[in-house]
Interface confidence: medium
């Protein structure tokens, strides 16, 4: 089965710059298929823009200004690139790549889409670091005792742009766990969001990970926030004793003693 | 020019109660095109649901049914037993791939129909309320309540800022909510909830212990041995002196 990956969750540009959006095809030989690009402007219908066929022929939608979009494909790495020249406010949209995928039954085809890349245009000078800053909350003892379950909460703050994806996994497992999240909220010039995961008591002794995808993550890789196993039999610790990494490290472990 | 027009912009559906989405074609006969349905969920993921000629995306055949009403020139998608997973925006789209004449392999989309999922009507359930803290941050966790109407108050004398609560459907078909705030005196913050003309406090759920109000760590777990009394997370994050972790007890 064909699978389309758009590695950029978002792409932030200033006016008149060039944006390059990428689509990686797996499960199908790109040399034997056409790749299509669509855009969804806020409040508008999803619109076909341009396609590139297996033989390199480019087809643009009528009414699309010439020279605005450039599409290419690199068969060697099964990649298609959409280049948007001289970006302007009207280019703000989510851009999807897509392809027709043959089904097992002869003659049956479906069009599958990539996850989309949101093009953001800003005129703001932002702080150097606008990656999501995490704060973690561990289950309250009341919840673990009364409900034989515990809720982990992952708070992410001070990020830009607002496009962010959060999911949860147990350590050493690739299974995505069912979690819940709040809306992304604006705070001054940046955004915040939180996600929470409730697990049964038997899973509290496992390490959990809150995995965050964002354009400005350090090194461009998903940020993993580790939630340590909870010992449900230990109710408290001495509040005077903080447990942290060495003084010049930024990672601080605060053990707070509260009654709820 | 062809236009695909959804019947409604928003369709509220109840868990387990069948729902129907309709999409009419303007300017052309629907029989000249193949109709497709897609769902876009949070995070922009566009998932294929159905294409004419009985083609369904993985996992959709059991719970969805696509159809064409040639007489009314419209496409129909039935959600047979909606669950909270079915929330999202649903798009109809058409193409002529594989048909004779001047065919188009591009999709022409209609505007989306936003499907919101609500729990089915059920007896009223009182919430459980728990407080979680980290530094100046406080979260009030409100679990398993019905109906949805609720007011969550974080009680403190020194508020820095508060955020609107997130209210979502719980896996069991009730509601869960979280409200976050930042407070100078987070240790003294409690949470009170107004629901169904009753007030529920986080203190109602506190675990009662002996007169010291704390269970002391065992001798082998005392605070002189931090490696045993606390767990350092291996969080692969670098933040500006953020309080990364709290063990709320």
């Amino acid at each position: 089965a064909g699978h389309l990956e758009q590695p950029q969750i978002s792409s932030t540009k200033t006016l008149s710059k060039t944006a390059r959006l990428e689509c990686v095809v797996s499960g199908i030989t790109i040399s034997a298929t056409s790749v299509y690009w669509y855009r969804e402007r806020p409040g508008e219908v999803i619109q076909f823009l341009v396609s590139i066929s297996y033989d390199g022929t480019v087809r643009k939608e009528s009414g699309i200004p010439s020279g605005k979009f450039e599409v290419d494909r690199i068969p060697e790495t099964s990649t298609s690139t959409l280049t948007i020249h001289n970006v302007e406010k009207q280019d703000i949209a989510t851009y999807y790549c897509a392809l027709w995928e043959a089904q097992q039954e002869l003659g049956k085809k479906i069009k599958v889409f990539g996850p989309g890349t949101k093009l953001i245009i800003t005129d703001k000078q932002l702080d150097a670091d606008v990656s999501p800053k995490p704060t973690i909350f561990l289950p309250s003892i009341a919840e673990t005792k009364l409900q034989k379950a515990g809720t982990y909460l992952c708070l992410l703050e001070k990020f830009f742009p607002d496009v962010i994806k959060i999911h949860w996994q147990e350590k050493k497992s690739n299974t995505i766990l069912g979690s819940q999240e709040g809306n992304t909220m604006k705070t001054n010039d940046t955004y915040m969001k939180f996600s929470w995961l409730t697990v049964p008591e038997k899973s509290l002794d496992k390490e959990h990970r809150c995995i965050v995808r964002h354009e400005n993550n350090k090194n461009g890789v998903d940020q993993e926030i580790i939630f340590p196993p909870i010992k449900t039999d230990v109710i408290t610790m001495d509040p005077k004793d903080n447990c942290s990494k060495d003084a010049n490290d930024t990672l601080l472990l605060q053990l707070t003693n509260t009654s709820a | 020019a062809i236009e695909l027009v959804p019947e409604h912009q928003t369709v509220p559906v109840s868990i387990g109660v069948p729902a129907t989405l309709r999409c009419s074609m303007k300017g052309e006969a629907i029989g000249n095109y193949y109709i497709n349905w897609y769902r876009k969920t949070q995070g922009n993921t566009m998932t294929f649901i159905y294409r004419e000629k009985d083609i369904y995306g993985p996992g959709f055949k059991d719970n969805f049914q696509g159809d064409i009403d040639i007489a009314k020139n419209l496409a129909v998608l039935k959600i047979l037993a909606p669950s909270e997973r079915d929330e999202g925006s649903y798009y109809c789209a058409c193409d002529t791939l594989g048909m004779g004449g001047e065919y188009t392999d591009k999709l022409i989309f209609g505007k989306g129909t936003r499907v919101t999922v609500e729990p089915r009507s059920q007896p009223h359930t009182k919430p459980s309320v728990f407080v979680m803290k980290n530094g100046t941050n406080v979260a009030c966790l409100v679990k398993e309540f019905y109906p949805k109407d609720i007011r969550i108050n974080l009680v403190s004398s020194k508020k820095i800022t508060e955020f609107d609560p997130a209210i979502v459907i719980s896996p069991s078909g009730k509601y869960n909510a979280v409200k976050l705030g930042k407070y100078e005196d987070s240790n003294s913050v409690t949470c009170s909830v107004q629901h169904d003309n009753k007030t529920v406090h986080s203190t109602d759920f506190e675990v009662k212990t002996d007169s010291t109000d704390h269970v002391k760590p065992k001798e082998t777990e005392n605070t002189k041995q931090p490696s045993k009394s606390c767990h350092k997370p291996k969080a692969i994050v670098h933040t500006e002196k953020v309080n990364m972790m709290s063990l709320t007890v």
């Epitope: 990956e5 950029q8 990686v24 797996s26 990649t79 090194n219 890789v221 | -």
Partner: antibody, heavy 120, light 106 residues
């Protein structure tokens, strides 16, 4: 500037599994194709295969049955496993990154190379 | 799968122009790249997409590719250019290297 630092054993016995790692520093594994290339002593370069950071792979058909390339994005590293090695696998092994955009078909950054000798 | 053929060695006097060829079936339809490798070192990309130079590579390195042959040209060759040179292209989704050419600066 991205740097690739390789590590792994230098001496192996026939039939063992060769395991090499390539750590990416000052840059991201994300969005790139990561390759392994080898060079027997005094000979030319032979491409082993690539992996996209998300996990999709493509191998040299002549080595496909014995090769596994994997990535660990959390540790920013790329790994090579080559099963059932023989003396013919003695070579310097390089990890290399395919560039972005118009550099997509070229190896723009290389690791320092690891000499692996297979001998009984 | 296609093969790329290079001459085993090429000699040139300092200041002169050296040309190294790389031939393969319909190579002109593909992008060719060139790498320089000095003894005990990793290869360094000197030409990509037939004729483009990465930043930091001197202007004396140039490339062309048409028909069945790609050519790396070093004008005003210097002693420091003495090295092995490898051409590389893709055959479908597989990387193919030439056998390498030893450039000797006399």
């Amino acid at each position: 500037q991205v740097q690739l630092v390789q590590s792994g054993p230098g001496l192996m016995k026939p039939s063992e599994t060769l395991s090499l790692t390539c750590t990416v520093s000052n840059g991201s594994i994300s969005g790139y194709f990561w390759n392994w290339i080898r060079q027997p002593p005094g000979k030319g370069l032979e491409w082993i295969g690539y992996i996209f950071y998300s996990g999709s792979t493509n191998y040299n058909p002549s080595l496909k049955s014995r090769v596994t390339i994997s990535v660990d994005t959390s540790k920013n590293l790329v790994s090579l496993k080559l099963n059932s090695v023989t003396a013919a696998d003695t070579a310097v092994y390089f990890c290399a990154k395919l560039g972005k955009w118009e550099l997509r078909t070229a190896f723009d950054i290389w690791g320092q190379g690891t000499m692996v000798t297979v001998s009984s | 799968s296609s093969e790329l053929t290079q001459p085993p060695s090429v000699s040139v006097s300092p200041g002169q122009t050296a040309s190294i060829t790389c031939s393969g079936d319909k190579l002109g339809d593909k992008y060719a790249c060139w790498y320089q490798q000095k003894p005990g070192q990793s290869p360094v990309l000197v030409i990509y997409q037939d004729s483009k130079r990465p930043s930091g590579i001197p202007e004396r390195f140039s490339g062309s590719n048409s028909g069945n042959t790609a050519t790396l040209t070093i004008s005003g060759t210097q002693a420091m250019d003495e090295a092995d040179y490898y051409c590389q292209a893709w055959d479908s989704s597989t990387v193919v290297f030439g056998g390498g050419t030893k450039l000797t600066v006399l």
